[in-house]
């Protein structure tokens, strides 16, 4: 049994780090493998993560962690029974992937405007809370050619779009993702998408 692609880990800068790797052949990850992790810190204990399958040869492990601070460094040991397959380390503050925004809602009852709101995935005491910027993807199921990305570089998790910039009488979908510039993060996963019908019609004199 051998590792084809070494574990790569990302932290949500809150309480979970996710490690993914690929094995040399089909593996029952939860039955055959264990990922042991330990914070390099006085009197810390070794903790065990039971991986799940992620495709035929892929494994994924969700490591429970404390709040992240820049000094934190973890040792990682991947075991198959008594056999050590891989040994490495992981500094969560240097590999951050934010949590996806949630509760994406579309408000169409605002005159001439489509208002999108969503929730910041972090509590106010988390360092990422005031550092997130967002990308909102809007596309149409009726018009495959229409797909736009709106960059939201201000802190408020809202986006206003003039309803007149969207075609009337067709459905649109939106989703949002986040990243934190000062922490050099990757983009989060996209939020679940939400759908709405654009019923806005221009006033008669503008037609």
């Amino acid at each position: 049994m051998k590792v084809l692609q070494e574990p790569a880990c990302v932290s949500d800068y809150m309480s979970i780090s996710t490690c993914e790797w690929k094995m040399g052949g089909p593996t029952n990850c939860s039955a055959e493998l264990r990922l042991l992790y330990q914070l390099v810190f006085q009197s810390s204990e070794t903790h065990t993560c039971v991986p799940e399958n992620n495709g035929g040869v892929g494994c994924v492990c969700h490591l429970l962690m404390d709040d992240v601070v820049s000094m934190d460094n973890y040792t990682l040991d991947l075991w198959a029974g008594q056999q050590l397959l891989w040994k490495g380390s992981f500094k969560p503050s240097e590999h951050v992937k934010p949590r996806a925004p949630g509760n994406l809602t579309v408000h169409t009852n605002v005159s001439d405007t489509v208002l999108l709101t969503w929730s910041n995935p972090y509590p106010p005491d988390n360092y990422l809370y005031n550092d997130l910027t967002y990308a909102v993807n809007i596309w149409s199921e009726n018009d495959p050619a229409y797909s736009r990305i709106h960059n939201v570089t201000y802190l408020k998790p809202t986006l206003r779009i003039p309803a007149s910039t969207l075609k009337s009488g067709i459905s649109y979908r939106a989703r949002v993702r986040a990243w934190a510039q000062h922490y050099n993060t990757t983009w989060s996963e996209w939020s679940p998408s939400t759908k709405w019908y654009n019923s806005y019609r221009e006033p008669f004199e503008q037609r």
Epitope: S43, S44, E45, L64, V69
Partner: antibody, heavy 125, light 112 residues
């Protein structure tokens, strides 16, 4: 009441051995790291050794490494310090102390907040 | 190893007057914001040490509020706002960032 009680001290010849014990009560012993600190006559405090709550991780001062062994029996709520190859400079009062909560991912530290009464070790021929 | 240097080593104080003890470490004891791994202990004559302050500025349970700790990184201070006769003894700073834990030399506080 949270309490630590040491025992096992005494007079021993150079090169001899002693085993110190520290019985804990009033707290969940297995969740805490534990530490030994000593004080030579008329001197200051010197850290000797520490052990994590599970007993898997141990730490030693250079002055005792290879001669002293720290261990614990969580079923008996007891900490031990096995002292071999004793030297005159090991003469001191030995204290055990309750250290950090080590079962959390990042151990939680509240100082060495409970100390035993101390047990005296004298190494002399 | 981290070296802890205390000053003064002797501190005669008049009851009711303030007292201050300084402790300097050879490297930073700041692990994360608000978490400086330095403690202060008092050892009264013939007794075991007792914890006064942990993590730089957090008062241990049952410690009178006339004791306070401050500082960050490498420079730390223990202050007693009004010294009482029962405060006499040896005061030690200790770093607990990692092993080996190291203590300062101790400061002997005595009443004038």
């Amino acid at each position: 009441e949270v309490q630590l009680v040491e025992s096992g001290g005494g007079l021993e010849q150079p090169g001899g051995s002693l085993r110190l014990s520290c019985a804990g009560s009033g707290f969940t012993f297995r969740t805490y790291a534990m530490t030994w600190v000593r004080q030579a006559p008329g001197k200051g405090l010197e850290w000797v050794s520490s052990i994590s709550g599970s007993g898997d991780n141990t730490y030693y001062a250079d002055s005792v490494k290879g001669r002293f062994t720290i261990s614990r029996d969580n079923s008996k709520n007891t900490l031990y310090l096995q002292m071999n190859s004793l030297r005159a400079e090991d003469t001191a009062v030995y204290y055990c102390a309750k250290d950090r909560v080590s079962i959390t991912i990042r151990p939680r530290y509240y100082g060495l907040d409970v100390w035993g009464q101390g047990t005296t070790v004298t190494v002399s021929s | 190893d981290i070296v802890m240097t205390q000053s003064p080593l002797s501190l005669p104080v008049t009851p009711g007057e303030p007292a201050s003890i300084s402790c300097t470490s050879s490297q930073s004891l700041l692990y994360s914001i608000g978490y400086n791994y330095v403690d202060w202990y008092l050892q009264k004559s013939g007794q075991s040490p007792q914890l006064l302050i942990y993590l730089g500025n957090k008062r241990a349970s049952g410690v009178p509020d006339r004791f306070s700790g401050s500082g960050s990184g490498t420079d730390f201070t223990l202050k007693i706002s009004r010294v009482e006769a029962e405060d006499v003894g040896f005061y030690y700073c200790m770093q607990a960032l990692g092993s080996p834990y190291t203590f300062g030399q101790g400061t002997k506080l005595e009443i004038k």
